[in-house]
Structures are given as structure tokens and as C-alpha cells.
Interface confidence: medium
Amino acid sequence: KLTIESTPFNVAEGKEVLLLVHNLPQHLFGYSWYKGERVDGNRQIIGYVIGTQQATPGPAYSGREIIYPNASLLIQNIIQNDTGFYTLHVIKSDLVNEEATGQFRVYPELPKPSISSNNSKPVEDKDAVAFTCEPETQDATYLWWVNNQSLPVSPRLQLSNGNRTLTLFNVTRNDTASYKCETQNPVSARRSDSVILNVLYGPDAPTISPLNTSYRSGENLNLSCHAASNPPAQYSWFVNGTFQQSTQELFIPNITVNNSGSYTCQAHNSDTGLNRTTVTTITVYAEPPKPFITSNNSNPVEDEDAVALTCEPEIQNTTYLWWVNNQSLPVSPRLQLSNDNRTLTLLSVTRNDVGPYECGIQNELSVDHSDPVILNVLYGPDDPTISPSYTYYRPGVNLSLSCHAASNPPAQYSWLIDGNIQQHTQELFISNITEKNSGLYTCQANNSASGHSRTTVKTITVSAELPKPSISSNNSKPVEDKDAVAFTCEPEAQNTTYLWWVNGQSLPVSPRLQLSNGNRTLTLFNVTRNDARAYVCGIQNSVSANRSDPVTLDVLYGPDTPIISPPDSSYLSGANLNLSCHSASNPSPQYSWRINGIPQQHTQVLFIAKITPNNNGTYACFVSNLATGRNNSIVKSITVSASGTSPGLSAGA
């Protein structure tokens, strides 16, 4: 099939294009080119007869067209009007016609663009700037570059007018950059020269240096002022409100007490019309001034931060003194003084370090004290406390829980039920509760300043039925005549009566037995071995009652004065001596024997076979209870007689 290929398809003005013919039939008589999509004699460009090799221009011939024997058409010096369709009409020898159409598009060679701006000196935070890429060109694409990067995404940057205009709203000093625009079409791409945006800003609040504000008579005062500004600021100095000079630096030699006062630096930007001032108070001392304390950390965090308190002003050859809570400094590894005593450092502050702190400067006549300074130590939160302490509630009542945790600043509270956040309040209130309000209630205390959080979890059970109670004890092994024991009946429940039984009987009347905490706690003072009984607590309300399992009190006692048996003290020679020692004690004591003061064996029974008069003497049994820490002993005299010398003597065992 006869086809036309345009090479190239997109043609730049002034260049040339070749309309290349493919699949040209054999046995041709001739062919003709026409402008447009159809054969129209009025729009014939050129005709060609093969037999005569004769080319004949038509009405649309411009003199820029060349036809080739293969029917291709070259058009030179392309102009915008050349855009469009071209039709080749082929006449075969048998006079049968064939047609094909091709096309190309003409684009101008783009000129180098330039940027125009509606505001050459925009003011920061006030003005908008609109950059426009010139010239306006049909069928061109516009692109923008900032510092040779594509445009950042910003709500303050807006493209409009087919991307030809870039608007910067509320310019800031950070918008000072190199801006370029680029135009593109299918045949060319051109970039503009850079335009530097000159944003007027400032002046910012000036900074006066040095920061030192205390001077002694006779020193030179040299103050310098600086404020960020475009164009650079103009500076003026005022002392106590009176204009001094228009310079960036203020120099006063050999100052006196009269030079004390407020020193103001004023920065002025003539383009923005703005003024900013900073004031510093300069104090010139003739003699040691009243000191004052500065701190490097006004809100230290407990157990984390150190605080350095410095006694101002710095005066050469001066003795500095410190007081805490109106006392001289205590000895503490957490308190450190600098070599000149001017700086007191508290390492790892605690909530007890609030002070007040005072420093003093010693002169020839007296000590000048600073005003007291109190530290605001941030601490906590500690573990929160949930009140009331009830864990068991009856359906239908109101549940009102309050949470508190020691904290500075005061903690912010959150409540969670079963791990799910409920509300951000210190109090949690649920009216008319039912069993489904049972759950794990967590209070979370958060200190926004330290960033620390602590939680406490409380189990709340809502039930008409009371649970089986249990007994907790503050002392599982009390010592007789020394310790007290407090039994507590768990859980703590609202509107509940607590009862106690000892060995299945109601409580005996005794000054050593005391009920407290709504009968929930039973305290036994000065326990005795007779208190080692089975204790049961019970809970009851109008619906149900329940008893705990018994808890048996294990009282540690003894050892009591031991008893040596048998009681005999006279023996016949040749008998066996078999002495047994026993002492009431819990736990069982350790036994040991001494004969005439000489340690023997650590057994409860002492056995000596076939004794003789040499075994006469004092036999002592020693008992000790490691649990009570108590000891006891008894001494027995044993007399051994020669056989047959005295009637009534024991034969021994």
C-alpha cells in the first residue's frame, strides 16, 4: 500500500522536511503533490511526468519544494504555514489513480526565555512575588527550577497561567534563591538566566554581646550589637533612653558607677521600615555588690539532671559562701563546689533539693547575702494510688475511682479499662454499675515535663455474690512477746460486714486483740504461743456470705529453761550416765552440753558409759533458737560414789 512518511514529523521553523514515499507502484505515468488531504487543482504544489522527466509547478508551489524521481518531496526553509497534510496523487500507465496522504507539524525554534517579576524587593512575611516566564509561546510547556532543583512541594508556591507564572506567597528569607524558567516544545528546550530573589527581612531582635552585665569601676565597656537584616541594619545606641551614637559598637572607657543603667541597641532596616530593640542592664559596682544566684537549669528532672548554681557577679579575689535551708552546706557526695566556691553543683537532684539556696560575698566588714532561690525540681509521677481501695462492688451502685500520683508538675491522668483508653481525667465515674463493668482498671499518670509515666492496675469485680475471702498477714512468723500480727480479710468490698473466728469460736475478749478498718483487720499484739490457732475471716452482705480457708499462726517462741532428766544427781560408780535435755521451743532448739565448763557434744542426749568418781562435776545443757535469736541453759551437779559406800544411790541406766 502506498504510504507517506514525514521525516521528521515535528519540524522546526527554517529547517527542512522530507515527505518520503513508500511502496510506489510500478509502471507509472506520473505523480502530483497537493497541499491538504485531497486532490485539488488549486492546491497543487508540483507535478512530475516520468516519460519526460519534466516537473511542473502548481498554484501552491512556493519555490522551496523539490520533487525526486522516487516521488518523495523535500520542503526547505519550513515556515509555520507549512504545517498540515500533503497528498500524493499517482497516475499509473493504465491511467488508474492511487493516493496517499502524510502530515507534519511545524514548531517555532524557541527563543531563550527570561523571567519578569512583579516585585523586585519583597518584604518577608508580607509580600507575594509573581515570576512570569517570557515570552508567551503557543504550544510550549513551562518548567521552573529553584537552585537548579525542581520546585519543592509547598502550600506557599503556586503555578498558574499554564505554569507560566510562579507565585510565592508570604515570602520568607529562605526563599532567597536562584530561580530559572524553561520553555519546551517538540523541537527545542531553552532555559532562562537565573533571577536571584532578594527578600527584604528584619531586623530580627538584636543580640548584644558580651552577655556579661556586671562590671567594676575602672573597666572599659565595649558592647557590640547585631541583628539579622536585609539590607544590613543601621544601629543606634541609647543609654537610659538618651541617644548616644549611630554605630554597631559602643565603647566607653574607664566606667564608673554613674555608667550603670539600661543600654538599648536599636536596629533599623530602611527598606522594610522596621525597628527592633534589645535592652541590657549594665551594673557598675564600686564595691562588692549584693550577690544573686543564676541557675543553668530552672526545671531540673529528679534523678536525671544536675543543677549548677552560680553566685553572681564574678569578682576577682572574693570569697563566696553558700547556705541551704538557712544552714551551711551539708557534707554530701551530691554537692560539689567549684575551685573558687562560686558555683555549687547538685548532682542528680531529688525532690528534697528544692532549697532555699543562698550565696554570699565576703568583704572586709561583712557578708552580703543573695536573695533565696528555690529550685523547681520536676519529679514523678510516683506509682499512682487508686482510691477507694475497694475491689468488690455490688451491682447498681456508682463506681467512683480517684487517682493520685506525686508529681511536679501535677500529673495528667488517663483511665484504661481492660487495656483500652477511657478518659483523660483524674476521677473515673460510672453510674449504676453491672457485672459487665468488672475488669482491670488502670490509672496512668503522666508528667508532661519529664515525659515519665507510671501506672497502677486495680481489679474491680462487680457481683451480687461475694467471693470466697482470703487472709493476708503482715508477719508470717511472729516472735512471742515481741511481735504483733495484723491479719487482713481480702478483698475490701463496699457495704460488707467482716467477721472473725478463732479455732471455730467467735473472737475472745482480750486487750491484745484489736479490730480495725471496719473489722477487716484483726491485730494481735505481743503474740504468745497460745495464739498459734486457726483463724478464719468471713464476709457477708444482704445477699450472700462466705468464709475464708483457715490460716494457722506460726508463733516462734523459746527456748524455755530446759529440763534435764532423769532428775537424779547421785550415781554409783560403774553405772551408765544417760542425761536427756528438753526445752519448749518453736522451731526446735539446738542442744549442746558442757561438763565442768568444757564443751561436749551437740546432741539432745548425753551418754557416758561406766562412770567413775572422775565424772563428778557440773553438767550444763545449753539450748538456742536461731529463729527467735534467744538462748537458755540449766546446770545440774552430778556426784559419783564408789560402789557400796552409800545406800540409796542410783544404779544408773
Epitope: 451491682p395 484504661l416 482491670l440
Partner: antibody, heavy 124, light 110 residues
Framework: QVQLQESGPGLVRPSQTLSLTCTVS????????MHWVRQPPGRGLEWIGW????????EYAPKFQGRVTMLTDTSKNQFSLRLSSVTAADTAVYYC?????????????????WGQGSLVTVSS | DIQMTQSPSSLSASVGDRVTITCRAS??????????MHWYQQTPGKAPKLLIY???NLQSGVPSRFSGSGSGTDYTFTISSLQPEDIATYYC????????FGQGTKLQIT
Amino acid sequence: QVQLQESGPGLVRPSQTLSLTCTVSGFNIKDYYMHWVRQPPGRGLEWIGWIDPENGDTEYAPKFQGRVTMLTDTSKNQFSLRLSSVTAADTAVYYCNTRGLSTMITTRWFFDVWGQGSLVTVSS
Amino acid sequence: DIQMTQSPSSLSASVGDRVTITCRASKSVSASGYSYMHWYQQTPGKAPKLLIYLASNLQSGVPSRFSGSGSGTDYTFTISSLQPEDIATYYCQHSRELPTFGQGTKLQIT
């Protein structure tokens, strides 16, 4: 004595609505969150959702959202499950259950009281 | 929602053996000092039965040979000495958000 009993048709046609009722005895359902859990044959347990019979509040598993409805009749101490547009994949044993107070520590959502289960087959 | 991965899916053990099943959550199911993980036993044709609640608490009436432990995302269920009546499928379930169950572990006796 606490008891939960599921009831409803054992056979449901595809694209129809499955309906089950759970009848509770031994406690007032208004005091508990009531749940439905199902178990396809030979497969694991799937939680469907809960209803608070006191106020009709519900929460459903995302898988069933849009197909499931839970209702309650507190006068009869009953709650029900409706699952629409069923397919063979909905064939399962359906259990109603709740968190009781048999533990000293109580919390949503573990289940210590269950019905015996009701097998529902989806088939034409 | 939180996904539960239970392993193994089945296991065989002898009477008296110590048996351990693990369950891993796709994110932590612990909050405010508690772990919201529970374990159930299901015998064929019966409803599941709660054994362990809040990771380690033994449900009333459940033998002490059953125990649970873990926090965060990783949890373990243990039978200290396997008995013939322990043949069942065991499921873990979390309640940190809307509940989901593990896929189950089928326990058989060799």
C-alpha cells in the same frame, strides 16, 4: 445454674439468612456482654461479634461486617444472630457465650460460659 | 486486627510427658501490667472450656498441671504431666482488641 442454649434451623439455603437464638438462664443478660463464636467443621474458632443487651450496642468482626445483625429480647432473656447472604462457607457450629464471674480477675473478652453449640448447614 | 500464630498445629506425646504449645501475636497484647492472652481446651463435639486467663491465671476447677506464661507478643501454654483425658484441641485467644483465636493445636497420645 448458669446455662446458654442455642436454637434455630439446622439447614439454610444459600443466599438466605441464617437465624439463631440464644436463651439464657441463671443470670440477667443485661448485666453481661453476649457474644457469638462459630467453628466450621474441622476448623478453628472464629469470633463473630458482641451485643450489650442493656442498650443494644454491638461490635462485629470486620469479616462479617455488613452481613451480620445481633438483636436482643431482654424480656425473654434471649439474644439472636442473623447472618445474611449465606454460602456453603458459613456452614459451622455456632456458639453463644459470655464472660462470667467465675474468676476473681475479670476482664473482657474471655469466655468462661458457653452454649453447647448449634450446627447450621448451608446447602441447597 | 491482631493475628495469632499458634504452633505446632498438631503434636503427639506420651502420658506423663511435658507438653508445650506456643502462640505469637502480630503485635503486643500486653497493657497496663496485664497480658490479654487466654487458653481453651476443646474436646470433640463439645464447646471450648477456659483453662488459663490473662496469660497465667488458672481458671477455677482446672487442674494445676496446666499453666501459662508470656508477655508482649510471645506466649506459652504448658501441660506439666500429660494425662489421657487431656486429648483435645487447644486454642489461644487474645482480647487486647476485638478477639481473635489461634488456629488450634491438636494433641494426641502416642
